[in-house]
Amino acid sequence: IPVIEPSVPELVVKPGATVTLRCVGNGSVEGDGPPSPHWTLYSDGSSSILSTNNATFQNTGTYRCTEPGDPLGGSAAIHLYVKDPARPWNVLAQEVVVFEDQDALLPCLLTDPVLEAGVSLVRVRGRPLMRHTNYSFSPWHGFTIHRAKFIQSQDYQCSALMGGRKVMSISIRLKVQKVIPGPPALTLVPAELVRIRGEAAQIVCSASSVDVNFDVFLQHNNTKLAIPQQSDFHNNRYQKVLTLNLDQVDFQHAGNYSCVASNVQGKHSTSMFFRVVESAYLNLSSEQNLIQEVTVGEGLNLKVMVEAYPGLQGFNWTYLGPFSDHQPEPKLANATTKDTYRHTFTLSLPRLKPSEAGRYSFLARNPGGWRALTFELTLRYPPEVSVIWTFINGSGTLLCAASGYPQPNVTWLQCSGHTDRCDEAQVLQVWDDPYPEVLSQEPFHKVTVQSLLTVETLEHNQTYECRAHNSVGSGSWAFIPISAGAHTHPPDE
């Protein structure tokens, strides 16, 4: 570490005095201090000498010397006071710029350490400091305003008490700059806009920032629009608002609008789309198939998407039959708005009953007229089966009736022994009826089919079973011939 001679931390001299500061080190040395006149600097090998034969108050300051080759970067310092009875302050800078919440050093150096007890910081023209100004003083460095705020951007003077009167320094202007976290915050409303040609429209682009220095503009397609801004300052933010008012829109006004704001940190932009239409519109659609099939007892939600401008004046769900004259309960109808011009309407049908199959229509109205979207709901049922013994054209015939939805398929089984249901081990014969006769097939109802099995002779120790199945399930009926006559019964549940 280099050494300064004289080897004292502080040196106090009078104006006009000769001052010599010698810095001695192992290698070459460099000195630095406040920029001031009348110093002569020369080197002789391992020492550096700073001298003046006419010290002034402007030589007041801290002088430091370093050894550039020293890897530890050691340095030595001495503080020189040139105590001028007429000049208690040496101001090193007249403008100080810091960011908010940084410490701001106002570099007014006291020229006489004895005056330290009577120093104070004031604003120019003797005005007191702003409330909550937290500061400290160092005779070597000056006044430090701690965690400076934007509002403390003022002109300051350092004051010292000399012979009972206050002597001021020249003024120091403090500029506290807002810390700008990024580009201005933006809003553009509405997010989407639809108007009929000739209607009025308004688009509002606004930007805000902690600093006043930012620009905002509204752009249509690639054209910057000339819109006067409305400016405001609240909640410690500057706000600039551009409002585009169109009294009568035309197709030329349609397109993409971008709100763009920029500052030193960069640029932000947000966009919206403006659609101009010739007349009112109302479009109904569904992502679901309009023909729905659901198993009885299950639930279903019917969903309709509505795109409309102007807004809906009325809407409702209606049951169009063919069963009861019941109408959907309002509490089961739900509406959600995706955005200004798109809505979703849902009808919840929980635990569907047979009487709830049929047509459900969603109707909506706006100035463009009425529109309807109709769903057809068919319920699926597992087959129900019954078998009877009869004679047709003199032949003994087993007649199997099966009803369900979708249309059931029919299979006949003949098996040994008396049983409610034939199992594989007992099966003697199997007949598939690929084309059973359809007895009834009305929309939204079960389909009833009939299958005939002609039996020349009923074997008494055997069982004849009619099985029907569809995509929902299966049903069966076992026919057991007994000597006293034919006996039929369905399988145990």
Epitope: D215, I227, P228, D247
Partner: antibody, heavy 123, light 107 residues
Framework: EVQLQQSGPELEKPGASVKISCKAS????????MNWVKQSNGKSLEWIGN????????TYNQKFKGKATLTVDKSSSTAYMQLKSLTSEDSAVYYC????????????????WGAGTTVTVSS | DIQMTQSSSYLSVSLGGRVTITCKAS??????LAWYQQKPGNAPRLLIS???SLETGVPSRFSGSGSGKDYTLSITSLQTEDVVTYYC?????????FGSGTKLEIK
Amino acid sequence: EVQLQQSGPELEKPGASVKISCKASGYSFTGYNMNWVKQSNGKSLEWIGNIDPYYGGTTYNQKFKGKATLTVDKSSSTAYMQLKSLTSEDSAVYYCARRGDYSGSSYWYFDVWGAGTTVTVSS
Amino acid sequence: DIQMTQSSSYLSVSLGGRVTITCKASDHINNWLAWYQQKPGNAPRLLISGATSLETGVPSRFSGSGSGKDYTLSITSLQTEDVVTYYCQQYWSTPFTFGSGTKLEIK
């Protein structure tokens, strides 16, 4: 030469409406916003509002909303201001004035002015 | 709305002399200020925009200064034709507002 030529003086009865015109020449009419300014007998100036001749966008001083309606006819490079439900308070000289800067939103000083139209409202 | 105050409605001036017209905004206007000159029976004429920028064709004896809320229009070597009314106008925020005007009169 850039000029704004305003229509002649108007004498109207209270409750009536009046439509005054401002014909632009010597520059691209749709490129500059047109502003309207009111000056009541030798008093100060009041900004009424502006219209963008290309887009038709308008901005009104809230004080004149409902009183003044600004329109343009691009084919004849003419801006119009209609004043309705006239009262003696509306007696003034009305100026049309071109916005000074060509693009962007920043500069709304007025570099070219019409000679003014005097509107007198008297029964 | 931002109020623009021209504290002197009338100022007595000497030909050949210097005059300073002041304009104070009720809020910070970021130098977005224009000065106009109006002669009797005429429309206003733009002299200065951006608080300091002289318009083309305006004599250099006119100058503008100021920042924040306080602005001034200075005229040096005052000529007879300058003894008219001057208005300031802020265009920082809508509605744009004008000062009440300062009329110069020869002493």
